[in-house]
């Protein structure tokens, strides 16, 4: 057992049939020494009395709010919870495995830039009696800070029968070094509870692997003279590191109709203009990625041909 | 070149050569990408290799007051990488390919540091660590940190150089 | 199957011209931009032009600008290169080519020998 | 227009051995840069789109890598049929050009 915060602890269960469970000892916060009882969430059927009650933790029934009482006054609550092992291995349930870019994936993490700032997010089908709480650090063993804001419900899906609920986060780390070379990885912590059950989830990264650039700016066409061919222009994203003539991106241009089987050009380069053809009823998109490391490229920019 | 007396060094050359090393690190093995290896725990194998830090002066600004201590930074650990690449974890079993883009990485790494430091001049190198792996899978793994590191070190490197070639060649 | 079947080998004396036919199976040539590539014995390959058969658009290499016009028939599922005043210089293979995407080729032609006589 | 010089013009080789044909661009064209084979004979066969980019039906003993101006294709343990031709073509800009190739050719 042990305490998650204030007057908050969890229970670590091996999770299996006529499991023995785990003792747990309660202490009543009080100067009090006699005339204690103790109940537990809403009941009134009184479990014990005296300053500490012992007892066999086995299953979400014995977990829960215990509360210590004289007289009809309370005097302290303890609430707590189980963390489930399953085979050796820690329960699951609260949050999707999204299986990107690999299986037991349950937080993904990107950045726009070198700042230090990033945002994590995690997809769970439950809508209610659910809390996060996120914490990160750089390295582990001596950790250099990385603060993090409250998780918030960002998005709502419907994915077939069920509805897909998205929570993000954002953290910064407190002393940046955009140009350095990390040699440490970000690791970013979240406690999930929902009702009674507590379950951790972790990720480890460098910053540089989870780069995802904004996409370009302000496209531009221009038609060339005596040719089916067009000149097209865009800018670096705003949200991109400074100055560009270090942290530089390179960029894929494309065109292409509506359907992804319809023929197509690309083409690639480090400018920041390019020439095309463009075809009527096509687009012209602009996708950036870091120039000189491969992370993930951003999502498209475009403008229609005609 | 970047002579430790303080001239500047080739920056259009160093540009070319070290966005080329970016492309030879990813080439080399492009799979590393997708492997977890801070997964496979044993992280003093890759603890040693040098890395260019927050006071090492490879940000714009620092560039623009000393570029020496950076480049020093960066000769240091090209020597080191491409010893690296030269020894037993590359050339033992399981063989590389002799046409694997590691063999141009080396070249290439020997290239960069020569640009930056001429004959007779002298940087202090790092000691190389002495990693011996005695299995084969072991120097598998090691080769894959290795690379995995290698890339983010030349990413800095052309960074810099790309950096210096726009705004600090005469 | 995706395949391009092109006109025979043909023999034409200086200075005529010459049509060549590449006729599409298992797809619309309208799906696919067409490209045109010259290869004399033994040596490189040469780019002369690609269509887009759905709108007639065509962009030549500036060598053969005025040497070669590229037309194409979407009713007869076909591309055609037609070739002026030639000379030995004109005799070669020609390949035609379908493209998904307008700069690289991935189905080609078995390719048409053009001999020219003087 | 963009000139690609390749290198060595013949490569003289035994099955089973690995080899690497050079291409130079004679100006920076990113990772705009494919590979054709060509046996004797037969028309040519993209192997390698965009540099690096594999192409499905392409034993994977063929791969390329290289962006700006130097590009390598490396074939890992040669098989007879590999024998011919290999051409590289740059699509930066129009005209779109060729490589004079590079001969594999039996030792």
């Known amino acids: 057992i042990w305490e998650l915060k204030k007057d908050v602890y969890v229970v670590e269960l091996d999770w299996y049939p006529d499991a023995p469970g785990e003792m747990v000892v309660l202490t009543c916060d009080t100067p009090e020494e006699d005339g204690i009882t103790w109940t537990l969430d809403q009941s009134s059927e009184v479990l014990g009395s005296g300053k500490t009650l012992t007892i066999q933790v086995k299953e979400f029934g014995d977990a829960g709010q215990y509360t210590c009482h004289k007289g009809g006054e309370v005097l302290s609550h303890s609430l707590l919870l189980l963390h489930k092992k399953e085979d050796g291995i820690w329960s699951t349930d609260i949050l999707k495995d999204q299986k990107e870019p690999k299986n037991k994936t349950f937080l993904r993490c990107e950045a726009k830039n070198y700042s230090g700032r990033f945002t994590c997010w995690w997809l769970t089908t439950i809508s209610t009696d659910l809390t996060f709480s996120v914490k990160s650090s750089r390295g582990s063993s001596d950790p250099q800070g990385v603060t993090c804001g409250a998780a918030t419900l960002s998005a709502e899906r419907v994915r077939g029968d069920n509805k897909e609920y998205e929570y993000s986060v954002e953290c910064q780390e407190d002393s940046a070094c955009p140009a350095a070379e990390e040699s440490l990885p970000i690791e970013v912590m979240v406690d999930a509870v929902h009702k009674l059950k507590y379950e951790n989830y972790t990720s480890s990264f460098f910053i540089r692997d989870i780069i995802k650039p904004d996409p370009p700016k302000n496209l531009q066409l221009k038609p060339l003279k005596n040719s089916r061919q067009v000149e097209v222009s865009w800018e670096y994203p705003d949200t991109w590191s400074t100055p560009h003539s270090y942290f530089s991106l390179t960029f894929c241009v494309q065109v292409q109709g509506k359907s992804k089987r319809e023929k197509k050009d690309r083409v690639f380069t480090d400018k920041t203009s390019a020439t095309v053809i463009c075809r009527k009823n096509a687009s012209i998109s602009v996708r950036a990625q870091d120039r000189y490391y491969s992370s993930s490229w951003s999502e498209w920019a475009s403008v229609p041909c005609s | 070149r970047a002579v430790p007396g303080g001239s500047s060094p080739a920056w259009t050359q160093c540009q070319q050569l070290s966005q080329k090393l970016c492309t030879l690190a990813w080439s080399a093995h492009p799979l590393v990408g997708h492997m977890d290896l801070r997964e496979e725990g044993d992280e003093e194998t890759t603890n040693d290799v040098p890395h260019i830090q927050c006071g090492d002066g490879c940000d714009p600004q620092g560039l623009r007051d000393n570029s020496q201590f950076c480049l020093q930074r960066i000769h240091q650990g090209l020597i080191f990488y491409e010893k690296l690449l030269g020894s037993d974890i590359f050339t033992g079993e399981p063989s590389l390919l002799p046409d694997s883009p590691v063999g141009q990485l080396h070249a290439s790494l020997l290239g960069l540091s020569q640009l930056l430091q001429p004959e007779g001049h002298h940087w202090e190198t790092q000691q190389i660590p002495s990693l011996s792996p005695s299995q084969p899978w072991q120097r598998l793994l090691l080769r894959f940190k290795i690379l995995r590191s290698l890339q983010a070190f030349v990413a800095v490197a052309a960074r810099v150089f790309a950096h210096g070639a726009a705004t600090l060649s005469p | 199957e995706v395949q391009l079947q092109q006109s025979g080998a043909d023999l034409v004396r200086s200075g005529a011209s010459i049509k060549l036919s590449c006729t599409a199976s298992?797809?619309?040539?309208?799906?696919?931009?067409m490209h045109w590539v010259k290869q004399r014995p033994e040596q490189g390959l040469e780019w002369i032009g690609w269509?887009?058969?759905?709108?007639?658009?065509?962009e030549y290499a500036p060598k053969f600008q005025g040497k070669a016009t590229m037309t194409a028939d979407t009713s007869s599922n076909t591309a055609y290169l037609q070739l002026s005043s030639l000379t030995s210089e004109d005799t070669a293979v020609y390949y035609c080519?379908?493209?998904?995407?307008?700069?690289?080729?991935?189905?080609w032609g078995a390719g048409t020998t053009v001999t020219v006589s003087s | 227009d963009i000139v690609l010089t390749q290198s060595p013009a013949t490569l003289s080789v035994t099955p089973g051995d690995s080899v690497s044909l050079s291409c130079r661009a004679s100006?920076?064209?990113?990772?705009?840069l494919h590979w054709y084979q060509q046996k004797s004979h037969e028309s040519p066969r993209l192997l390698i789109k965009?540099?690096?980019q594999s192409i499905s039906g392409i034993p994977s003993r063929f791969s390329g890598y290289g962006s700006g101006t130097d590009f390598t294709l490396s074939i890992n343990s040669v098989e007879t049929e590999d024998f011919g031709r290999y051409f590289c073509?740059?699509?930066?800009?129009?005209?779109?050009?060729f490589g004079a190739g590079t001969k594999l050719e039996l030792k």
């Open positions: 080519n379908a493209c998904k995407e307008l700069r690289y080729f991935d189905v």
């Open positions: 298992g797809f619309n040539i309208k799906d696919y931009y």
């Open positions: 269509i887009d058969p759905e709108n007639g658009d065509t």
């Open positions: 100006q920076s064209i990113s990772i705009n």
């Open positions: 965009f540099a690096s």
């Open positions: 073509q740059q699509s930066n800009s129009f005209p779109l050009t």
